[in-house]
């Protein structure tokens, strides 16, 4: 899937854009907002009625090398009594993010953008029930 | 991240970390197409902490369209279909990487940008404190 070209709504003199070889693009991986600290709700993964755990995946040929994935702890949801209610479902919520993949081809190294599907957390849903004849 | 060249015969001058600027192929490697989350699942309607999805569009960013979740209620939906305010609908937030056109409007020059998105909502049982 290719990145769409900018439409005609913008006009930029070609000389002010860096020259880029055909079929590729220039990517600065110094992240904008890298040091922005996010105030996430504490313990939401433990206090949720559809709680989850986190696993860190690590790949030295990926940037960023660490990607955190969530896994729902239960099939059902936790009720007011703290017991699992299997008439409800804990389901994963997913979001796509971009990573840069480093590839070795012989002695040369190339870089490829990749979309990664990250499981962010879980939510409790009412299942759709079908009675099979 | 550290990498060792695959071929022992390769010169070992490779930087172990990613360089600051790289040339990447215009084709994004991915089996997951960027779909509207409304079409990919109806969890946003069936959750006990349902949410609405708002379209955030920015032509200077890739992907240009990102869907933001907003919890529909302060509380959660109980078994009777009513809002239970002793529970909380809380957004699940995630930092993701996107591409920002840099310099602006340039077709093939980007910089990675970290943004915080609300992906969905989850129902939380709060710990209660009575303030003296």
């Amino acid at each position: 899937r290719k990145i769409p070209k900018v439409g005609h709504t913008f006009f930029q003199k070609p000389e002010s854009c860096p020259p880029v070889p055909g079929g590729s693009m220039k990517l600065d991986i110094g992240i904008i907002n890298e040091n922005q600290r996010v105030s996430m709700s504490r313990n939401i993964e433990s206090r949720s009625t559809s709680p989850w755990n986190y696993t860190v995946t690590w790949d030295p040929n990926r940037y960023p090398s660490e990607v955190v994935q969530a896994q729902c702890r239960n099939l059902g949801c936790i009720n007011a009594q703290g017991k699992e209610d299997i008439s409800m479902n804990s389901v994963p919520i997913q979001q796509e993010t971009l990573v840069v993949r480093r590839k070795h081809q012989g002695c040369s190294v190339s870089f490829q953008l990749e979309k990664v599907l990250v499981t962010v957390g879980c939510t409790c849903v009412t299942p759709v029930i079908h009675h099979v004849q | 991240g550290i990498t060792i060249p695959r071929n022992p015969g390769c010169p070992n001058s490779e930087d172990k970390n990613f360089p600051r600027t790289v040339m990447v192929n215009l084709n994004i490697h991915n089996r997951n197409t960027n779909t509207n989350p409304k079409r990919s699942s109806d969890y946003y309607n069936r959750s006990t902490s349902p949410w609405n999805l708002h379209r955030n569009e920015d032509p200077e960013r890739y992907p240009s369209v990102i869907w933001e979740a907003k919890c529909r209620h302060l509380g959660c939906i109980n078994a009777d279909g009513n809002v239970d305010y002793h529970m909380n609908s809380v957004p699940i937030q995630q930092e993701i990487l996107v591409l920002r056109r840099e310099p602006p409007h340039c077709p093939n020059s980007f910089r990675l940008e970290k943004i915080l998105v609300s992906v969905g909502c989850t129902c939380v049982t709060p710990i209660v404190h009575h303030v003296a």
């Epitope: 105030s39 709700s41 | 302060l74 909380n88 809380v90 710990i127 209660v128």
Partner: nanobody, 116 residues
Framework: EVQLVESGGGLVQPGGSLRLSCAAS????????FGWFRQAPGKEREFVAG????????EYAASVKGRFTISRDNSKNTVYLQMNSLRPEDTAVYYC?????????WGQGTLVTVSS
């Protein structure tokens, strides 16, 4: 530790108005929502109104919708409940609630009496 200071309760005639306020201090950061519950004598505590801090989205109990208005002052970490067209059935102890998603703080309550 979080402190909640409630004020504005009192005696009012049917059809009258009152304005409750609740100020949060201490470690009241990452607010999810701020609002009010009430408890009438011999009844269960019930939700009245709430305001989400991130976008000022408001929610009301059906019994008060159109009569009560919740608002906030971000800079003061304060929430207000403007109560108009008060009825005898609105008589209750009104509790301020500060919700931080996984932790919730309840105030001590302020008494509102609607009587002629």
């Amino acid at each position: 530790e979080v402190q909640l200071v409630e004020s504005g309760g009192g005696l009012v005639q049917p059809g009258g108005s009152l304005r409750l306020s609740c100020a949060a201090s201490g470690r009241a950061n990452s607010i999810n929502w701020f609002g009010w519950f009430r408890q009438a004598p011999g009844k269960e505590r019930e939700f009245v109104a709430g305001i989400r801090w991130s976008d000022a989205y408001t929610e009301y109990a059906a019994s008060v919708k159109g009569r009560f208005t919740i608002s906030r002052d971000n800079s003061k970490n304060t929430v207000y409940l403007q109560m108009n067209s008060l009825r005898p059935e609105d008589t209750a102890v009104y509790y301020c609630v500060l919700d931080l998603s996984t932790v919730r703080y309840w105030g001590q309550g302020t008494l509102v009496t609607v009587s002629s």
